[in-house]
């Protein structure tokens, strides 16, 4: 018969290294008689026999953790007791080894230039992973502005435009490497004016181009203000290259003004704005008020080609610096305004505007422009374009056109000479000739004047509405 023998642990527990989700086994070989009861603890807490995460075999001498989790880290002890002598204990550590894992990856960031940006990158792993960052395709170098914090996050002080780009963090230990997804750092820059418009002192009727260049991220928008209001006339051309917006406001100068360029861009819910102003003053301002002088020459332009008599001499007003060009731009601008009017009104208005801006001319010693006959002007105003004229006058009264009224250089009919008084003193508009009885065929025209003022124009066999002279080339 065997003699009773107190338990002796013949193979003390050792430190076990295990990867997450792998199996880890502690062996606790015991010699004793009678057979001991062996219990196991983790961090001094008893492991229950029915805990399905563990398997205890060989009379309790083998403890197997079936699928290691990172929380299984700790000190494991086996305690053997058979009632003979005292209980004996042996302990060993479980070190859960873990490939790097990024638990809080970086996210896309928009940041305003000059501020501080932090891109998070929290990691897990055993051994503790080292964290580095990649920008684009290259490893990111730390410097006085750029640092990788203990937590793994990337901190950039005083963010610059060149910091913009795609970043990813890299967590590395002896077991492997983990990469975050690419994230985008967008650096936003407040709108700033690079080139302010220049002030000009020009002659009446000159063309001036005001140029304003601004930079910012996002690319700013540029708007122009004339004497405190949105610019009512002129053409604006914009181009964008390399985040720089170049805006050119071309003006036909008939009055002095203060023009302000406003560059604006948006950062989240906030806007940043930069402004620059220039004055346009008119040299010899009184010149335009005097009786205009000019010269007679053939019309070489395009807009009124189909309207003006082919070989007629027209008057060019030398109060403009380049009369031919100035008058052509005026008519071109007016022509565009006419795109919205009715088919009945448009050819009549075109004939009126062209003959008003390019008046027939008698060369003589003093070149003399011949204005349109009052009756033809009234025909356009009160018959062909009655609705449009009333609408335009209404807008003018409500101040909708402000200084932009010159875009439609319409004559004041009442100030024009009558062809009944002196037929040689004014120009007829042949396109508007129509049979007197045709007047009654225009419904819904309400004249603002007595019917006696409706022109008595010469009868003609051609109907205004179908004259081929109105087709535009």
């Amino acid at each position: 018969e065997k003699l009773p023998k107190a338990p002796v642990i013949t193979t003390p527990l050792e430190t076990v290294d295990a990867l997450v989700e792998e199996v880890a086994t502690f062996m606790c070989a015991v010699e004793s008689y009678p057979q001991p009861e062996i219990s196991w603890t983790r961090n001094k807490i008893l492991i229950k026999l029915f805990d399905t995460r563990y398997s205890i075999r060989e009379n309790g001498q083998l403890l197997t953790i079936l699928s290691v989790e990172d929380s299984d880290d700790g000190i494991y002890c086996c305690i053997a007791n058979n009632g003979v002598g005292g209980a004996v204990e042996s302990c060993g550590a479980l070190q859960v080894k873990m490939k790097p894992k990024i638990t809080r990856p970086p996210i896309n960031v928009k940041i305003i230039e000059g501020l501080k940006a932090v891109l998070p990158c929290t990691t897990m792993g055993n051994p503790k992973p080292s964290v580095s960052w990649i920008k684009g395709d290259n490893a990111l170098r730390e410097n006085s502005r750029i640092a990788v914090l203990e937590s793994g996050s990337l901190r950039i002080h005083n963010v610059q435009k060149e910091d913009a780009g795609q970043y990813r963090c890299v967590a590395k230990n002896s077991l492997g490497t983990a990469y975050s997804k690419l994230v985008k750092l967008e650096v936003e820059v407040f709108a700033r004016i690079l080139r302010a418009p220049e002030s000009h002192n020009v002659t009446f009727g000159s063309f001036v181009t005001l140029r304003c260049t601004a930079i910012g991220i996002p690319v700013p928008t540029i708007s122009w203000i004339e004497n405190g209001n949105a610019v009512s006339s002129g053409s604006i051309q914009e181009s964008v290259k390399d985040r720089v917006i170049d805006s050119r406001l071309q003006l036909f100068i008939t009055k002095p003004g203060l023009y302000t360029c406003i560059a604006t861009n948006k950062h989240g819910e906030k806007f940043s704005t930069a402004k620059a102003a220039a004055t346009v003053s008119i040299a010899e301002w009184s010149k335009s008020q005097k009786d205009s002088q000019g010269y007679c020459a053939q019309y070489r332009g395009e807009v009124c080609d189909a309207v003006l008599a082919k070989d007629a001499l027209v008057f060019f007003n030398t109060s403009y610096r380049d009369p031919e060009d100035a008058q052509e731009l005026l008519i071109h601008t007016a022509w565009n305004e006419l795109k919205a009017v009715s088919p009945l009104c448009r050819p009549a208005a075109e004939a009126l505007l062209c003959n008003h801006l390019f008046q027939e001319c008698s060369p003589g010693v003093v070149p003399t422009p011949m204005p349109i006959c009052r009756e033809y002007c009234l025909a356009v105003k009160e018959l062909f374009c009655a609705k449009e004229w009333q609408a335009m006058e209404g807008k003018a009264h409500r101040g909708l056109y402000r200084s932009g009224m010159h875009l439609l250089p319409v004559p004041e009919c009442s100030k024009l000479p009558s062809m009944h008084r002196d037929p040689t003193a004014c120009t007829r508009l042949p396109y508007l000739d129509y049979k007197k009885e045709n007047i009654t065929t225009f419904p819904s025209i309400t004249s603002s004047r007595p019917s006696a003022d409706i022109p008595n124009l010469p009868a003609s066999t051609s109907s205004f509405a179908v004259s081929p002279a109105y087709s535009m080339t």
Epitope: C296, Q298, R300
Partner: antibody, heavy 121, light 112 residues
């Protein structure tokens, strides 16, 4: 600095086609009319075609009408001359020239250095 | 089609005055032809001198002046200099059914 640079010239057989380009820089291209003018070797200047600032009309010398097409791309600051059904008498240096104003006709105040077109079999 | 006529060649002494003319084979040159004048030196592109009868292009010396004299356009060089030796072309705007621009045959100016 204002510059007009022509390209696209070369040797072509009678009946063939060429497209000349004129790249403009140093001025607001779409504020000016443009023209093509040619000069046969040892001869004088000959106006070929003109186009106003907005490309709204086109004008041609009678002998090239129906064969040549002038056009412009204001966004690209470029003037073009498409020449089809070329004849030996079209052999010349082709100059691109800028008008002093918007309309198609009038004084030419800036010229390119020209591109040579040779029509020969 | 009207032909624009110019003297084939002219000569002038340095410091002298010379007038080049530009006429039409049929009819007179008027301000409605907007006479323009161009200068071309060998191997170079033309250069604008005078536009619309009498206006000088920027950078053109004041010794060059334009006018209409009788039924012709005229370019006068007062105080000719050796660098003025060149070919001179006039250009006229023409309207006869369609718009046109016509150059004269050119005048070869020699400064002796």
């Amino acid at each position: 600095e204002l510059q007009l640079v022509e390209s696209g010239g070369g040797l072509v057989q009678p009946g063939g086609s060429l497209r000349l380009s004129c790249a403009a820089s140093g001025f607001t291209f779409d504020d000016y009319g443009m023209s093509w003018v040619r000069q046969a070797p040892g001869k004088g200047l000959e106006w070929v075609s003109a186009i106003p600032w907005n490309g709204g009309s086109t004008y041609y010398k009678e002998s090239v009408k129906g064969r040549f097409t002038i056009s412009r791309d204001n966004a690209k600051k470029t003037l073009y001359l498409q020449m089809n059904s070329l004849k030996s008498e079209d052999t010349a240096v082709y100059y691109c020239a800028k008008r002093s104003g918007r309309i198609a006709f009038g004084a030419l105040d800036a010229w390119g250095q020209g591109t040579l077109v040779t029509v020969s079999s | 089609q009207a032909v624009v006529t110019q003297e084939p060649s002219l000569s002038v002494s340095p410091g002298g005055t010379v007038t080049l003319t530009c006429g039409l084979s049929s009819g007179s040159v008027t301000s409605s032809n907007y006479p323009d004048w161009y200068q071309q030196t060998p191997g170079q592109a033309p250069r604008g001198l005078i536009y619309s009868t009498d206006s000088r292009h920027s950078g053109v010396p004041s010794r060059f002046s334009g006018s209409i004299s009788g039924n012709k356009a005229a370019l006068t060089i007062t105080g000719a200099q050796s660098e003025d030796e060149a070919d001179y072309y006039c250009g006229l705007y023409m309207y006869s059914g369609s718009k046109n621009y016509v150059f004269g045959g050119g005048t070869k100016l020699t400064v002796l």
